[in-house]
């Protein structure tokens, strides 16, 4: 397993509709054809997997049907979007990138993006 640098923004504020987007960029040392991206959430010293997708370079990311994540890739950048967020989902979202094929296997873990989700004021039809 070889180390790889992964960059992501430090802070993102979710929209009033509970949507947060951020870019996860990795420094690919070679020409990977198969990449796996995992989003982890760290809160209260617990780390849980939010979503994961494997994609072939040049193709769309494919998350599971019931995933709360969507994403697109462009070169060594992955644009990730998480939906359905509310205040209790505030936390540090860590981007983990694995270059699966061809060998050698590379692993990179970002420092995390702190996503803040705010409960809107109680007004008609606001998003919570």
């Amino acid at each position: 397993c070889k180390a790889m640098h992964v960059a992501q923004p430090a802070v993102v504020l979710a929209s009033s509709r509970g949507i947060a987007s951020f870019v996860c960029e990795y420094a690919s040392p070679g020409k990977a054809t198969e990449v796996r991206v995992t989003v982890l959430r760290q809160a209260d010293s617990q780390v849980t997997e939010v979503c994961a997708a494997t994609y072939m370079m040049g193709n769309e990311l494919t998350f599971l049907d019931d995933s709360i994540c969507t994403g697109t890739s462009s070169g060594n950048q992955v644009n990730l979007t998480i939906q359905g967020l509310r205040a209790m989902d505030t936390g540090l979202y860590i981007c983990k990138v694995e270059l699966m094929y061809p060998p050698p296997y590379y692993l990179g873990i970002g420092n995390g993006t702190q996503i803040y989700v705010i409960d809107p004021e109680p007004c008609p039809d606001s998003d919570f």
């Epitope: 509970g18 049907d65 019931d66 939906q83 509310r86 205040a87 989902d89 409960d119 606001s126």
Partner: antibody
Framework: QVQLVQSGAEVKKPGASVKVSCKAS????????MHWVRQAPGQGLEWMGI????????NYAQKFQGRVTMTSDTSTSTVYMGLNSLRSEDTAVYYC????????????????WGQGTLVTVSS | DIQLTQSPSSLSASVGDRVTITCRVS??????LNWYRQKPGEIPKLLIY???SLQSGVPSRFSGSGSGTDFTLTISSLQPEDIATYYC?????????FGQGTKLEIK
């Protein structure tokens, strides 16, 4: 095991107020949102509002704005729903239901409901 | 205001039939939709969340699909205990509106 236990049935006169309680047990109270949903006799489900027990933040359905108040007491793991200026059409069974944050592992929304509290408004 | 419209409002089917209930939403909600079953005199029970995730303990004859504004609940082989009213609901964002319900009866 997870339980949401609601207060007993109430009979109220038009114009009066009612306060229904929902006591949670078997899970971390402040880690889940709580909703209130009502169902008039023979009718469908109607969402009333949501409260975040950890912050006290609330959001109410437009229909109930100004007439409903939802609060939580973390010391007793209880949420309350108060409805004032009662009218006959408020006669219904009132339910509380818990709702985890979307990022909670194996968390499903509205997975546990209280047993329901019948509120009858009659002169 | 967001609206959820279920169809049909009621339906009658035979044991073993494949039954489909649809829920149309007035705006795009991605996949953030629940399905419930409520038997007469009982509290609602969660069947499907996030459009297609089967809730723990729910029989595999229930399945959900759809995204955006059009969603479907399917019962692959109707059982006598499925006599109930079924509701869809928008979740994870207020207002958490319910559909008007679909009453399912056995022929």
């Amino acid at each position: 095991q997870v339980q949401l236990v609601q207060s007993g049935a109430e009979v109220k006169k038009p114009g009066a107020s009612v306060k229904v309680s929902c006591k949670a047990s078997g899970y971390t109270f402040t880690s889940y949102y709580m909703h209130w949903v009502r169902q008039a006799p023979g009718q469908g489900l109607e969402w009333m509002g949501i409260v975040n027990p950890s912050s006290g933040s609330t959001n109410y359905a437009q229909k109930f704005q100004g007439r409903v108040t939802m609060t939580s007491d973390t010391s007793t793991s209880t949420v309350y729903m108060g409805l004032n200026s009662l009218r006959s059409e408020d006669t219904a069974v009132y339910y509380c239901a818990r709702d985890p944050p979307i990022t909670m592992v194996r968390g499903a929304p509205f997975d546990y409901w209280g047993q329901g509290t019948l509120v009858t408004v009659s002169s | 205001d967001i609206q959820l419209t279920q169809s049909p409002s009621s339906l009658s089917a035979s044991v073993g039939d494949r039954v489909t209930i649809t829920c149309r939403v007035s705006q795009d909600i991605s996949r953030l939709l629940n399905w419930y079953r409520q038997k007469p005199g009982e509290i609602p029970k969660l069947l499907i969340y996030r459009a297609s995730s089967l809730q723990s303990g729910v029989p595999s004859r229930f399945s959900g699909s759809g995204s955006g504004t059009d969603f479907t609940l399917t019962i692959s082989s109707l059982q006598p205990e499925d006599i109930a009213t079924y509701y869809c609901q928008r979740t994870y964002s207020a207002p958490y509106t319910f559909g008007q319900g679909t009453k399912l009866e056995i022929k």
